[in-house]
């Protein structure tokens, strides 16, 4: 998906009313200095890729995040404000039922929502470059 | 099952307000927005506005911008939308309809309509 | 806004017809277009969504297909309670909108 069009205003809004609140939650009792961010990204759409395939797409040490409270927000922002995100997610929402939930909060999963939290305000921080 | 109950039917004179209630159940209110349209007499369907509980925020149709107004209240499972401002044209029935924004992505399920009359 | 234009107005047929609807959108839409039937005195109700996905409880003579700017609903053969207008809306991008209608009458 190409988020060139996006509303990064509106995304923005939410992340700083409600999503960025959801992810710390997550990560307490670690410290910002537990992790080094590895991932990063160069401007809004390329962002909101990086930060789509972090919470979204599962990994061998951290299987899904996306049944998580910051994930379903951050779904739910996207296909708002993206123009025509909503119907790429038909297909991987069947997909995503059928996986079983296996909810344990690993150390890979904190460094993955660390890395989360990074390009999230990287996001912020490319958005005031560009006002 | 998902219900959709909305308040009743309202007659109101011009210049007043109107709050139109949409009382949800049988699903998880958080997991779907609540979109507001609207239908004049003999017309189409005209898409007001959505507040996403989730999310806990709102957008309006700009034709409705600082006229309409969209809450919900999370304890209850019940939305809002409220009109000021009212002139004859916004006689019409309203509907409120659910709409996943995690999945399904369409305007599934839809209240059985609140009709009202502006009228002096 | 994204503007949908529906044809055509009225279509009168017989049951047992096929009838076929048009919804053409003013910019190219992948296919975020879904379709209701609203009968007088009722809500719409949800017939196909994302163009050609059926629901379930909707019987299988009522079709979707298309994408980019053109869409159709197909009927394959028209029953007495299939006498409706009917509605495309996309949810492409906010504001989400509506077409502008077709009644389908008994000829």
């Known amino acids: 998906y190409d988020f060139t069009n996006c509303d990064f205003q509106k995304i923005e809004a939410d992340y700083l009313r409600t999503i960025s609140k959801d992810l710390i939650t997550y990560m307490s009792g670690t410290k910002s200095t537990d992790f080094n961010n590895t991932v990063s990204c160069s401007n809004r759409p390329h962002c909101l890729t990086e930060i789509q395939s972090l919470t979204f797409n599962p990994t061998p040490r951290c299987a899904s995040l996306a049944k998580e409270m910051f994930a379903r927000k951050t779904k739910a922002t996207l296909a708002l404000w993206c123009p025509g995100y909503s119907e790429t997610q038909i297909n991987a929402t069947q997909a995503m039922k059928k996986r079983r939930k296996r909810k344990v909060t690993t150390n890979k999963c904190l460094e993955q929502v660390s890395q989360l939290l990074g390009l999230w305000r990287r996001f912020i921080r490319t958005l005031l470059k560009k006002q | 099952q998902v219900q959709l109950v909305q308040s009743g039917d309202e007659v109101k004179k011009p210049g007043s307000s109107v709050k139109v209630s949409c009382k949800a159940s049988?699903?998880?209110?958080?997991?779907?927005?609540m979109h507001w349209v609207r239908q004049r007499p003999g017309q189409g369907l005209e898409w007001m506005g959505t507040?996403?509980?989730?999310?806990?925020?709102?957008d309006y149709n700009q034709n409705f911008k600082g006229r309409a107004t969209i809450t919900a209240d999370k304890s209850t499972s019940t939305a809002y939308m409220e009109l000021s401002s009212l002139r004859s044209e916004d006689t019409a029935v309203y509907y409120c309809?659910?709409?996943?924004?995690?999945?399904?992505?369409?305007?599934?399920?839809w209240g059985q309509g609140t009709s009202v009359t502006v009228s002096s | 806004e994204i503007v949908l234009t529906q044809s055509p107005g009225t279509l009168s047929l017989s049951p047992g017809e096929r009838a076929t609807l048009s919804c053409r959108a003013s910019?190219?839409?992948?296919?975020?277009v879904h379709w209701y039937q609203q009968k007088p005195g009722e809500a719409p109700r949800l017939l196909i969504y994302?163009?050609?996905q059926s629901i379930s409880g909707i019987p299988d003579r009522f079709s979707g297909s298309g994408s980019g700017t053109d869409f159709t609903l197909t009927i394959s053969r028209l029953e007495s309670e299939d006498f409706a207008v009917y509605y495309c809306?996309?949810?492409?991008?906010?504001?989400?909108?509506f077409g502008t209608g077709t009644k389908v009458e008994i000829k």
């Open positions: 049988g699903y998880i209110f958080t997991d779907y927005a």
């Open positions: 507040f996403i509980p989730l999310l806990d925020t709102s």
């Open positions: 910019q190219p839409i992948s296919i975020s």
């Open positions: 309809a659910r709409m996943g924004v995690t999945h399904s992505y369409v305007m599934d399920a």
């Open positions: 994302f163009a050609s």
């Open positions: 809306q996309q949810t492409f991008s906010l504001p989400y909108t």
